[in-house]
Amino acid sequence: DWVVAPISVPENGKGPFPQRLNQLKSNKDRDTKIFYSITGPGADSPPEGVFAVEKETGWLLLNKPLDREEIAKYELFGHAVSENGASVEDPMNISIIVTDQNDHKPKFTQDTFRGSVLEGVLPGTSVMQVTATDEDDAIYTYNGVVAYSIHSQEPKDPHDLMFTIHRSTGTISVISSGLDREKVPEYTLTIQATDMDGDGSTTTAVAVVEILDANDNAPMFEPQKYEAWVPENEVGHEVQRLTVTDLDVPNSPAWRATYHIVGGDDGDHFTITTHPETNQGVLTTKKGLDFEAQDQHTLYVEVTNEAPFAVKLPTATATVVVHVKDVNEAPVFVPPSKVVEVQEGIPTGEPVCVYTAEDPDKENQKISYRILRDPAGWLAMDPDSGQVTAVGTLDREDEQFVRNNIYEVMVLAMDNGSPPTTGTGTLLLTLIDVNDHGPVPEPRQITICNQSPVRQVLNITDKDLSPHTSPFQAQLTDDSDIYWTAEVNEEGDTVVLSLKKFLKQDTYDVHLSLSDHGNKEQLTVIRATVCDCHGHVETCPGPWKGGSGGGGSGAGVIAVIVVVVIAIVAGIVVLVISRKKRMAKYEKAEIKEMGEMHRELNA
């Protein structure tokens, strides 16, 4: 039948490998040649190749020793197909159960277990639990069943059976009375764990049982009076270490000290903590002390333990006299950050503000001032009076130095103490806008058709703030209004430039004057390229002599150089020639316009 009973394979097999386990056999092999295969983890999926099957014979083989502690059971599928690959049987479950061998010793979870119990406790008191694990099977065999025992106890006082261990749980408990910390503060037990429920392999570990002290000794100050000197203003400064002695177990809650300031610190200037190693009380400043306000503090410190006293005990108190040492304190600007409104462009030498500092010290120390950081170099500061004046032109529109209308300056005050100390202040100048910028059109170069031209919309920008901005006004100058019109839109923030008369294809200067709401005027020359075309245009079509062509030849480069030279010469000539000469281009354009009209009429 096409069924295989679960196959049991002992772990750690010695081989040799491949080792035969079972033969898969289909009774369909009478009719046709059968080919066998297996699938599943351990065959064709990880861990691959542990098991294999001979294709023609159906023999199931084991290729390596198994480890039950790694994989305890393999679930494979056996397949049978005919020569043409057609399945002749349903996949068959093959269960391979790895049977356990006692190949692991018990292992304690720790080399050394630590537990504690109060001195004088009654027998039966639980101390601690130890644990040993064994990777072997503890369900179907005793291979992994662990039994605990105590092998030895040191010291053997008052006798050698002070503790017992539960055979199966590993719980150690007190079995005899007489635990006395003053005589024996610690016991060392050698414990054993044995598998096969006590009949197999043994491993050992150590259990250290600390006998805890009852808190029957109060900590005592040694000495009881302290005197300390502390510089003023320092936070976190160690004032004094207070030492105590305690007869209880070192580093136990009954020995560890807890300190409290019980008097003399009405201003909450001090704090006291316990040093984790020395158990001293470390008195430190929580706030800076002020010599000018109080030059001496007398503190009262009380000490107790972390653990409450087991019996009624007197609490020790120490006195600490703290002398405050005077320190030269830094001048302090008032306020630390000063905001001043000042108009941009004020004349050089004009006062901006007075910015001074105060010295916390009692002596009347002399304070001198200087500018520490003035990125644009616009200000000066009088060293004696703290008077800040303008030495450069304050420019609100200078984007390099001014952010959100604010110019930030850092100033320094220095006293004449020994050693001298310094303090800094921040001066924030809020620059008030002045109408010092005229409106400017964008772009300043346009290309336009000379037939059915499209209106050119230019944006108007003004660096100033309202009300020194829009609405803007536009006016054409230098006879540019003969051929062009300029109109500001309703919102007053764009100007529309239109060609109103025919001009031949060429480049022209359009003189546009823009003024803002505060009548600040700015003349801008718009470079207009007029093209022989209709409607909208980006660049002039056809052979255009006015610009540089796209040629890549040497001749083209020479031509460009020639044009540039001519342009420079022409520029010089333009500066010399009169307005009439400048109008010649427009007059020729008029003649050409009339010629065009004449041609159209003849046509």
Epitope: F35, G49, A52, W59
Partner: antibody
Framework: VQLVEESGGDLVKPGGSLKLSCAAS????????MSWVRQTPDKRLEWVAT????????YYPDSVKGRFTISRDNAKNTLYLQMSSLKSEDTAMYYC???????????WGQGTTVTVSS | ELQMTQSPSSLSASLGERVSLTCRAS??????LNWLQQKPDGTIKRLIY???SLDSGVPKRFSGSRSGSDYSLTISSLESEDFGDYYC?????????FGAGTKLEIK
């Protein structure tokens, strides 16, 4: 018909290396364990190495462990034996043999001669 | 290492005669034993696997058996092609080990 044919045998100096090949045909090579066996000049047969069908696991006697490596290429239906640190006692006729019916040494090749001599 | 002691080391027999070869295992190997035949040209062939199972194509005059730790190969009636060397090999314990061989000659 199941056929195995060895090649690669040669004369090699002590300490040298050599790689033997065994080409298989006539059976599904990839599902059978394969071994190398050698026959010394005094006619004694000695098992040299075995490899599992998928090539994941290999086994050697102590006499060759660490010096010889058995491997296979199931795509090429070929078994290999890489021999290094050769000694004069490795002189033998080397045969490759397949498992069949879960049992070793079912089908044998003609053998290839390895001579280790200075 | 498990030892396979093969006897006799050589044997002369006549055609038609019944002969038996023996291998003794120094430890238990169960039924994990094969018998091999080597012809004078060096060709090796497996005759018997698992102590007593006959390989396909092997004449029925060959048979294998076991008695305790002794394993036998019997040829019921010798034929001319049966002459050559015969080896046992165990695979019940690692490493696999061979008998020293028996040379079967024509008398």
């Amino acid at each position: 018909v199941q056929l195995v044919e060895e090649s690669g045998g040669d004369l090699v100096k002590p300490g040298g290396s050599l790689k033997l090949s065994c080409a298989a045909s006539g059976f599904t090579f990839s599902t059978y364990g394969m071994s190398w066996v050698r026959q010394t000049p005094d006619k004694r047969l000695e098992w040299v190495a075995t490899i599992s069908s998928g090539g994941h696991y290999s086994y050697y006697p102590d006499s060759v462990k660490g010096r010889f490596t058995i491997s296979r290429d199931n795509a090429k239906n070929t078994l290999y034996l890489q021999m290094s640190s050769l000694k004069s006692e490795d002189t033998a006729m080397y045969y490759c043999a397949s498992y069949y019916y879960g049992s070793p040494f079912a089908y044998w090749g003609q053998g290839t001669t390895v001579t280790v001599s200075s | 290492e498990l030892q396979m002691t093969q006897s006799p080391s050589s044997l002369s027999a006549s055609l038609g005669e019944r002969v038996s070869l023996t291998c003794r295992a120094s430890q238990d190997i169960g039924s994990s034993l094969n018998w091999l035949q080597q012809k004078p040209d060096g060709t090796i062939k497996r005759l018997i696997y698992d102590t007593s199972s006959l390989d396909s194509g092997v004449p029925k005059r060959f048979s294998g058996s076991r008695s305790g730790s002794d394993y036998s190969l019997t040829i019921s009636s010798l034929e001319s092609e049966d002459f050559g060397d015969y080896y046992c090999v165990q695979y019940g314990s690692s490493p696999l080990t061979f008998g020293a061989g028996t040379k079967l000659e024509i008398k």
